[in-house]
Amino acid sequence: VEVQVSEDPVVALVDTDATLRCSFSPEPGFSLAQLNLIWQLTDTKQLVHSFTEGRDQGSAYSNRTALFPDLLVQGNASLRLQRVRVTDEGSYTCFVSIQDFDSAAVSLQVAAPYSKPSMTLEPNKDLRPGNMVTITCSSYQGYPEAEVFWKDGQGVPLTGNVTTSQMANERGLFDVHSVLRVVLGANGTYSCLVRNPVLQQDAHGSVTITGQPLTF
């Protein structure tokens, strides 16, 4: 028996359902009584879901997995994972045994988009050219961790005096805070771009300093 899975990682958004595709080619006369199907976490060998002795043995993994019972006889051994969490991310191995056995691993990549950045300025009043200001760009509830890029009004990257920190919340999603320290010119725009590397999603925030008032 030959097992086939997707070469590319399956990308799933947090809280959505994902299908980890796995298939085999049944011989003529194949019946489900002959099938042993096991899904497990590749690294820890933890059992996720199984079908043995002619019946679905159910989920061994947080009760959020399901097979496609009507399609098994056609060789579809795919696994449905419901309400995906950050902790579900990783490699899953599909084992199929009929007379002989084969296995293959598929990677699940979890993602969550970042919020539109909020911008704060310190100090935020009585600003003069030549003042040192701290601009903070904050974006929330994304996954995996973000890359943050700063640019000035002319699109020139600002790389010095930038400190970026990540904080994972109880769901494993990241809040990102990036701080730019810059000496003010006569006026100027400072932009931060928060990029989710998996989704290739860019979230933009900017602050324009033109004397008073400030524009966000």
């Epitope: 991310e89 990549q109 995996p144 990241f174």
Partner: antibody
Framework: DVQLVESGGGVVRPGESLRLSCAAS????????MNWVRQAPGEGLEWVSR?????????YYADSVKGRFTISRDNSKNTLYLQMNSLRAEDTAVYYC?????????????WGLGTLVTVSS | EIVLTQSPGTLSLSPGERATLSCRAS??????LAWYQQKPGQAPRLLIY???SRATGIPARFSGSGSGTEFTLTISSLQSGDFAVYYC??????????FGGGTKVEIK
């Protein structure tokens, strides 16, 4: 079994360079963030650098090494690297390769045995 | 940067006694704290993560508790192999990922 094996340590003079390697096995290397942690003789543990998983190459450094050290990984070779330039006496330490428990939980569930870097004139 | 302060610096106890090690964070880190054991000449070993979850293969005599800024590692009955240095580490906000200065548990 998970194994992390560091190599590349040695004795160098201040200002010189060294490249450390960490060969990983027993887990899906590309799925995990990886780190370097060091320990100066008789001192505590100090996190040095982290690189996130897959091929995204998002990297982080301790202030003490920023601009001098570069972390990288080759997922096809299951290997983590640390390029150390402009070495100083205070970089003398045992350097450990450590695997993050997950991409969002940066505790270190597996460690290598370490490789000693000595910077001395 | 989150600073972790471990106390005491050294704990002198006899086998069979109970060891209580403290780790205090300079700001709240929820439960994002790990504990490690390190014996001389060896790499650190993960004992506890998530403040209270035992790592794979760690005996039940090791337990962790606390959240926010105050954390405790308890060894219920010290065995000869438990005399070592113990470090706490936070992973709530980074970089940097920070360690405490360590507590040495030695034989009295």
């Amino acid at each position: 079994d998970v194994q992390l094996v560091e190599s590349g340590g040695g004795v160098v003079r201040p200002g010189e360079s060294l490249r450390l390697s960490c060969a990983a096995s027993g887990f899906t290397f590309s799925n995990y963030a990886m780190n370097w942690v060091r320990q100066a003789p008789g001192e505590g543990l100090e996190w040095v650098s982290r690189i996130n998983y897959k091929g995204y190459n998002i990297t982080y450094y301790a202030d003490s090494v920023k601009g001098r050290f570069t972390i990288s990984r080759d997922n096809s070779k299951n290997t983590l690297y640390l390029q150390m330039n402009s070495l100083r006496a205070e970089d003398t330490a045992v350097y450990y390769c450590a695997k993050s428990g997950s991409n969002s939980n940066n505790f270190f569930d597996y460690w290598g045995l370490g490789t000693l870097v000595t910077v001395s004139s | 940067e989150i600073v972790l302060t471990q106390s005491p610096g050294t704990l002198s106890l006899s086998p069979g006694e109970r060891a209580t090690l403290s780790c205090r964070a300079s700001q709240s880190i929820r439960s994002d704290l790990a504990w490690y054991q390190q014996k001389p000449g060896q790499a650190p070993r993960l004992l506890i993560y998530g403040a209270a979850s035992r790592a794979t293969g760690i005996p039940a005599r090791f337990s962790g508790s606390g959240s926010g800024t105050e954390f405790t590692l308890t060894i219920s009955s010290l065995q000869s192999g438990d005399f070592a240095v113990y470090y706490c580490q936070q992973y709530n906000s980074w970089p940097p990922l920070t360690f405490g200065g360590g507590t040495k548990v030695e034989i009295k």
